[in-house]
């Protein structure tokens, strides 16, 4: 009787189970009656990922680098290129087809964590007794000066945008 | 249905060549293999090697592989094997078969090598 | 290469009787797949060869049950359970699972 169902790594084809062609490799002859399935090693600009029949390899990614592009880790047979952004610029999807500008933290909002080539910069308001006074991609909120460590008193208090004003203490007659 | 209709009898010198061709229809020409035979008088069959369509790819019997040359012409559907320097040993029936969801043979093509 | 031995050279047969018909290689037949790539053919007078069995027991479509095939490794043997008038021709065994792809001598099944 014909198969009607192949084990692991099979594929039925002619009512013949016939091996898949392992990573890196393409079909080039589906098995027969008298031959096993026939393979090729991908060429060095291809790859393929998994057992499969394709008769073609896929290209390799390309990092464009006037996308803003560069290569992180340079595919093989098996596994495809992987970009990643230049410095300075991150990528605008999961599988990174272009870059974009790390966006800065308003005053007000300091970076709580810095951004990678594949990550934006996450901001997060300063909160009471914090601020940030510039427009930047790397400042986490700031402290407000301690006026009393300085033997100094708060002449104008401090916002999420601005630092407090010490100023000397009233001397009392 | 699938066919391989091969050309007629073909008459050499010795050191002449021959080109026997083979037309496939009824299936997708460039999925399978085309396999070359040949079976001299009263003799049994020799394997000379096969081709693949799709790219061109070849597997030779090491005997073969020198004189015998195996192309296909993918428009028309038609596989060609060509023996060249002919011998009086070479006097056969040449079969193209293709195998793959059933065995087919073509007809068969006379070669005579004769002085 | 492999060297496919057939044997009986000759083989005259009683219609309705069976016969058997042996094929021995050089080494053995046995792939890396697991698969053996032992086949068995037919040759009637003035016709191309026709497949009876492929992979030492598995009968293409159309062949009558009576033809079988077994063995393993090196040792292989067809069968026929009852000769008909029609099975008269030139058996062959061939081996694809090395290259160059080989063949037996031939079998020639007569009626007595």
């Known amino acids: 009787e014909p198969p009607t169902a192949c084990r692991e790594k099979q594929y039925l084809i002619n009512s013949q189970c016939c091996s898949l062609c392992q990573p890196g490799q393409k079909l080039v002859s589906d098995c027969t009656e008298f031959t096993e399935t026939e393979c090729l090693p991908c060429s060095e600009s291809e790859f393929l990922d998994t057992w499969n029949r394709e008769t073609r390899c896929h290209q390799h990614k390309y990092c464009d680098p006037n996308l803003g592009l560069q290569v992180q880790q340079k595919g093989t047979s098996e596994t495809d290129t992987i970009c990643t952004c230049e410095e300075g610029l991150h990528c605008t999807s999961e599988s990174c087809e272009s870059c974009v500008p790390h966006r800065s933290c308003l005053p007000g909002f300091g970076v709580k964590q810095i951004a990678t080539g594949v990550s934006d910069t996450i901001c997060e308001p300063c909160p009471v007794g914090f601020f940030s006074n510039v427009s930047s991609a790397f400042e986490k909120c700031r402290p407000w000066t301690s006026c009393e460590t300085k033997d100094l008193v708060v002449q104008q208090a401090g916002t999420n945008k601005t630092d407090v004003v010490c100023g000397p203490q009233d001397r009392q007659r | 249905q699938v066919q391989l209709v091969q050309s007629g009898a073909e008459v050499k010198k010795p050191g002449a060549s021959v080109k026997v061709s083979c037309k496939a229809s009824g299936y997708t020409f460039i999925s399978y293999y085309i396999y070359w035979v040949r079976q001299a008088p009263g003799q049994g069959l020799e394997w000379i090697g096969g081709?693949?369509?799709?790219?061109?790819?070849?597997n030779f019997n090491e005997k073969f592989k020198s004189r015998a040359t195996l192309t296909v012409d993918t428009s028309i559907s038609t596989a060609y094997m060509e023996l060249s320097r002919l011998r009086s040993e070479d006097t056969a029936v040449y079969y193209c078969?293709?195998?793959?969801?059933?065995?087919?043979w073509g007809q068969g093509t006379t070669v005579t090598v004769s002085s | 290469d492999v060297v496919m031995t057939q044997s009986p050279l000759s083989l005259p047969v009683t219609l309705g009787d069976p016969a058997s018909i042996s094929c021995r290689s050089s080494q053995s037949l046995l792939h890396s797949n697991g698969n053996t790539y032992l086949h068995w053919y037919q040759q009637r007078p003035g016709q191309s060869p026709n497949h009876l069995i492929y992979q030492v027991s598995n009968r293409f479509s159309g062949v009558p049950d009576r033809f079988s095939g077994s063995g393993s490794g090196t040792d292989f043997t067809l069968k026929i359970s009852r000769v008909e008038a029609e099975d008269v021709g030139v058996y062959f065994c061939s081996q694809t699972t090395h290259v160059p792809w080989t063949f037996g001598g031939g079998t020639k099944l007569e009626i007595k």
């Open positions: 081709i693949n369509p799709r790219n061109g790819g070849t």
């Open positions: 078969t293709r195998h793959g969801n059933g065995v087919y």
